[in-house]
Amino acid sequence: EPPTACREKQYLINSQCCSLCQPGQKLVSDCTEFTETECLPCGESEFLDTWNRETHCHQHKYCDPNLGLRVQQKGTSETDTICTCEEGWHCTSEACESCVLHRSCSPGFGVKQIATGVSDTICEPCPVGFFSNVSSAFEKCHPWTSCETKDLVVQQAGTNKTDVVCGPQDRLRHHHHHH
């Protein structure tokens, strides 16, 4: 009765358990009773990342600069190339097949987390006491200017999009204050 199963680094073919090819190599010929499995290394731009019985190696991924992609890690005979996005762009998926421009945070919003090659900018609304008057992919919400520390008074209240406007203290009120 021929075998119906094989060990993990083997595969069943013609009632034989043959050795799988190691990562980085492809199958050239199956084993026989008297000859071992024949494997050959993958070519320059090819890889296989598992113990396998593949007759063709996989092509390394191409990081297309026209799609905003660049090589993050060069592929080997055992690993695929890893692509990432050019500065200012991020991947649209985990496989990083294309890139999109980092989102900017509108006025009234600040950057909570700066974008990376794989994640977009995360914005947050500026809370009371903070503002952002620019559209930016880097700027956080800034605190309102403290007029008091400059010995000035608030002439115009701040908003989430504008800073407070400080002005000189009223001379008369200032004078009475000291009497």
């Epitope: 199963a5 094989c6 993990e8 680094k9 050795s19 026989t32």
Partner: antibody, heavy 127, light 107 residues
Amino acid sequence: EVQLLESGGGLVRPGGSLRLSCAASGFTPGSYEMNWVRQAPGKGLEWVSYISSAGETTDYADSVKGRFTVSRDNSKNLLYLQMNSLRAEDTAVYYCARDVFFFDSSGDNGAYGMDVWGQGTMVTVSS
Amino acid sequence: DIQLTQSPSSLTASVGDRVTITCRSSQGIRSSLAWYQQKPGKPPKLLIYGASSLLGGVPSRFSGSGSGTDFTLTISSLQPEDFATYYCQQLNSFPSTFGQGTKLEIK
């Protein structure tokens, strides 16, 4: 230290059942294929069963097929052999043994061997 | 199933002797063969895998050779601790099988 320790052996009547356990220490058994091998008193070694590292593939000697079931609990580092419909000829010392794949990337195909064995547990089937 | 036949079944030799044990397979198994040493009351101990590769820690007086159907285990110069029973095992396909054993006794 890498060790395997069998337990669960004993005296059982013909037709009875027994469950053997094999506890692994010093290594992660979930990364290895495992076997049960037995040895009747004064006799040679007889391979009994095999289980793959995740437990999805099993195989058995013809003499125990349909009566014995091998299983594993990788979260507890345990290997089991459920033995049903026991016969007098199942009387033996039962060893659990680790399958290891020896591989040198500069070499060719690699090779298997059983490099770690437990001390064994005695199973006696008698009326 | 693949049958393994060891010869001789028993062997008497002296310390310092060169000893050869053979293992013949009923069908070709390439180099999927291991050799074990077993002493009374103890579990087997792996010596050689892949027909000819010596396990780390095993003395270099042990060597294995062969491929296909004919295999040999050689002990170049017997030491007192080498007197034991030796088994070959095929790991080519299931069911895995062992030879019947060769008992090496002191003369």
